[in-house]
């Protein structure tokens, strides 16, 4: 569910939302750390209805959710880390 990507692409998110999405409707969360062409951390959420939204990293609900997911993944498998090439 929780993925961290290191990418040399520019920022992916044009606008961010802080609207709450319950975890039952979330398929995947992608975290893009700041740097490498983008000055801010970005969080991209894939929903179970196939839509995608950028979430404000400061939104309290996403911080709480990521903490829960980190705890869960650390007790099973490590959070996957991927390196992306420029297409």
């Amino acid at each position: 569910v929780l993925e961290v990507y290191y990418t040399s692409l520019r920022c992916r998110c044009v606008q961010e939302s802080s609207v709450f999405i319950p975890r039952r409707f979330i398929d995947r969360i992608q975290i893009l750390p700041r740097g490498n062409g983008c000055p801010r951390k970005e969080i991209i959420v894939w929903k179970k209805n196939k839509s995608i939204v950028c979430v404000d990293p400061q939104a309290e609900w996403i911080q709480r959710m990521m903490e829960v997911l980190r705890k869960r993944s650390s007790s099973t498998l490590p959070v996957p880390v991927f390196k992306r090439k420029i297409p």
Epitope: P22, R24, E60, W61
Partner: antibody
Framework: EVQLVESGGGLVQPGGSLRLSCAAS????????MSWVRQAPGKGLEWVAT????????YYPDNVKGRFTISRDNAKNSLYLQMNSLRAEDTAVYYC????????????????WGQGTLVTVSS | DIQMTQSPSSLSASVGDRVTITCKAS??????IAWYQQKPGKAPKLLIY???TLQPGVPSRFSGSGSGTDFTFTISSLQPEDIATYYC????????FGGGTKLEIK
Amino acid sequence: EVQLVESGGGLVQPGGSLRLSCAASGFTFSSYAMSWVRQAPGKGLEWVATISDGGSDAYYPDNVKGRFTISRDNAKNSLYLQMNSLRAEDTAVYYCARDYYGSGYEDSPMDYWGQGTLVTVSS
Amino acid sequence: DIQMTQSPSSLSASVGDRVTITCKASQDINKYIAWYQQKPGKAPKLLIYYTSTLQPGVPSRFSGSGSGTDFTFTISSLQPEDIATYYCLQYDNLYTFGGGTKLEIK
């Protein structure tokens, strides 16, 4: 007091369509996601659809996806379920239920339910 | 899809008895389980959510416990008005209800 009143149920032939409505009162409708849950005669509960507070997101289980459409009109405090290509196995009491509070971050499930409306699919 | 296996499907108990219903999830659902009571001809009523949080107005004789895949719903002292069918619901990944437990008085 939270009140949810369903309407629009009835007898419909297989392959037919029906539109259910749910009138909400006693809470700020536009702040809550809403869901439909059904119960076949003598059977258990089955989730049918959920729509976000603003109406931009909808979710369905695979068995109704592409046939059912959930929608809402926040100005009228109303929730809808458009059911197309109905099958005998869609026969059930359909309940509307208040779901999570969209303006918060408490991940709570459906808390208030209407009394239901019966949909019978038969030839 | 997550399956919820609820047991028993029916049970008979006496007033004052301690009653326990279990739900087993087919995969880890953290603590995202709720319990509902449904009386004949009525809508379901939420009793407990997030495993053990009692809905306001629900008597303290109702309680819930568990985490991961195994969950328990308990009525500490059965009352005549508790006769109903009880359902668990997982809301970790979409929604899945258990098959229900019909509770009767001996």
